[in-house]
Amino acid sequence: LIQERRSHQNNPAAHLTGANSSLTGSGGPLLWETQLGLAFLRGLDYHDGALVANKAGYYYIYSKVQLGGVGCPLGLASTITHGLYKRTPRYPEELELLVSQQSPCGRATSNSRVWWDSSFLGGVVHLEVGEEVVVRVLDERLVRLRDGTRSYFGAFMV
Amino acid sequence: LIQERRSHQNNPAAHLTGANSSLTGSGGPLLWETQLGLAFLRGLDYHDGALVANKAGYYYIYSKVQLGGVGCPLGLASTITHGLYKRTPRYPEELELLVSQQSPCGRATSNSRVWWDSSFLGGVVHLEVGEEVVVRVLDERLVRLRDGTRSYFGAFMV
Amino acid sequence: LIQERRSHQNNPAAHLTGANSSLTGSGGPLLWETQLGLAFLRGLDYHDGALVANKAGYYYIYSKVQLGGVGCPLGLASTITHGLYKRTPRYPEELELLVSQQSPCGRATSNSRVWWDSSFLGGVVHLEVGEEVVVRVLDERLVRLRDGTRSYFGAFMV
């Protein structure tokens, strides 16, 4: 029993939460809260928006983003792409892992109507030590942040 | 090998399913089937809609609700909120854990059109012994129950 | 530590990805890539679209499908059903495990408008040795495949 408990305590896991600073507008990935509130890191590291593996293996990675807007203003993409991407030193360009495309603006029948939508991604991927996973949303201007419960990013080893 | 197997058999996990009695209309959380069909409890308890932790640790908790309606009748919220909330003896009010907002009615272009939508939430949270997690949906009148496969609630220790 | 590591390496897990051959049009389940790209099988088998359990226990199973189209052509269902189903030798018919219904076409306000939507399912189910899980989508003509990152199917023992 002691052994079983210890194994759980050591199993890499993390849950990062959205904050006002998540949206940089710089074209980079979303940034995350790692310590306050519901956020934590256990056996994984964090660096500039990325969860970093300290132990090689298969991880269930997940992310949810809360989307919202008023109508569909011109200049905003009618398609929103939410994805989890891997960074690895050998391949400097990010590799797609899990991706969703949605057209939530279409729900609003007039330009003045408020709409909300949510996108959830989750799946098992392999990470080597030092490999990183980030979240991107295009167009990130439609991501609605509040208190860390509506947009988040996490992982655990399976 | 025996030890590995035992560790799996003892790992807290649960999957609860929606039933006709899930929607109380009382303003309380959704209630769930815990034993019949696909529902089970292993190392977690259930009490008045809540999954109750028997062992402290990090849990991946999840819920899906099936939403549906005919048009968007007046009096129904155009925004639906689906959330997982924690109850802990130290705080009298429920704490938001994972929340989604959606505007599914906007999909129906006329008041007579049938629409369906689904909301999925999942993420890792920490639970102490005796802490509870519940599911709430506002407006719960739009939750469509059938056979326990469309609306459900579960957790497992990671 | 050796034991904990071994237990992770042996823990059944799989992630299968969508490919052009996934959609058969035959009324059968979706088929999947099992080896290349992000796809892998560890302690689970694959057979004609199905993940097959080699070890009895509780599994978190999940699937995401990317949906998309242009308007809502006549003859296409306005409701899309995405589900995970169990095949077991004891019962000739597939058993529903986790199911979602969505009406994504309603998002397109004209017949020429492109729309995208995504459906995610995940939950814990019990599988005996030899039992199979498959993914079905009705109407599968609306499933959009690309690169294995947008539509996928996986599982791991919890």
Partner: antibody
Framework: QVQLVQSGAEVKKPGASVKVSCKAS????????ISWVRQAPGQGLEWMGW????????NYAQKLQGRVTMTTDTSTSTAYMELRSLRSDDTAMYYC??????????WGQGTLVTVSS | QSALTQPASVSGSPGQSITISCTGT?????????VSWYQQHPGKAPKLMIY???KRPSGVSNRFSGSKSGNTASLTISGLQAEDEADYYC??????????FGGGTKLTVL
Amino acid sequence: QVQLVQSGAEVKKPGASVKVSCKASGYTFTSYGISWVRQAPGQGLEWMGWISAHNANTNYAQKLQGRVTMTTDTSTSTAYMELRSLRSDDTAMYYCARLYRNWFDPWGQGTLVTVSS
Amino acid sequence: QSALTQPASVSGSPGQSITISCTGTSSDVGGYNYVSWYQQHPGKAPKLMIYDVSKRPSGVSNRFSGSKSGNTASLTISGLQAEDEADYYCCSYAGSSTLLFGGGTKLTVL
């Protein structure tokens, strides 16, 4: 860094078998497949098949089915390719390569197999 | 499934740009963004130059670029140099756990 080192050159008679090894280092061996590719003198690359190191699943090119067997030894992070009933047209450079997603990287240095009576 | 089609040879002078094509079908090249390119010098093992149609591994010169249009992928080498003289092979995912190689193209730097 990630590296694949293959066994040395072999000379075999027609009808014999050859077993080429490929030792991996610098990554988690059991998390990737190993593919085998051969190249006859002056010819292009020919994919022979691969093996998934974590579950030993194999996938062989149709023209080699029944003559080729790919195996792994996870304890030594080594992959093996055995080709039986050798013919003169099996004379080639045999390469192993890590199968990373949908490409081959890195490659072993190659093992020359000469089939001659 | 037959091999992808590449020209047997191409040539160019130092400083010029050349493009090598790789033609398949909608079931392989056209169906996925999973085309890779390999460079092979005489007597050496192949080396990955491009993956996922257009991405370069670390250490590969930015003179090498990849693209795709329909069922045809292309490798372009700009500012041609003497050391670029080699054989080049394309490879594409073709579904159902299958990868296909092209027949290879011999690049001569004049």
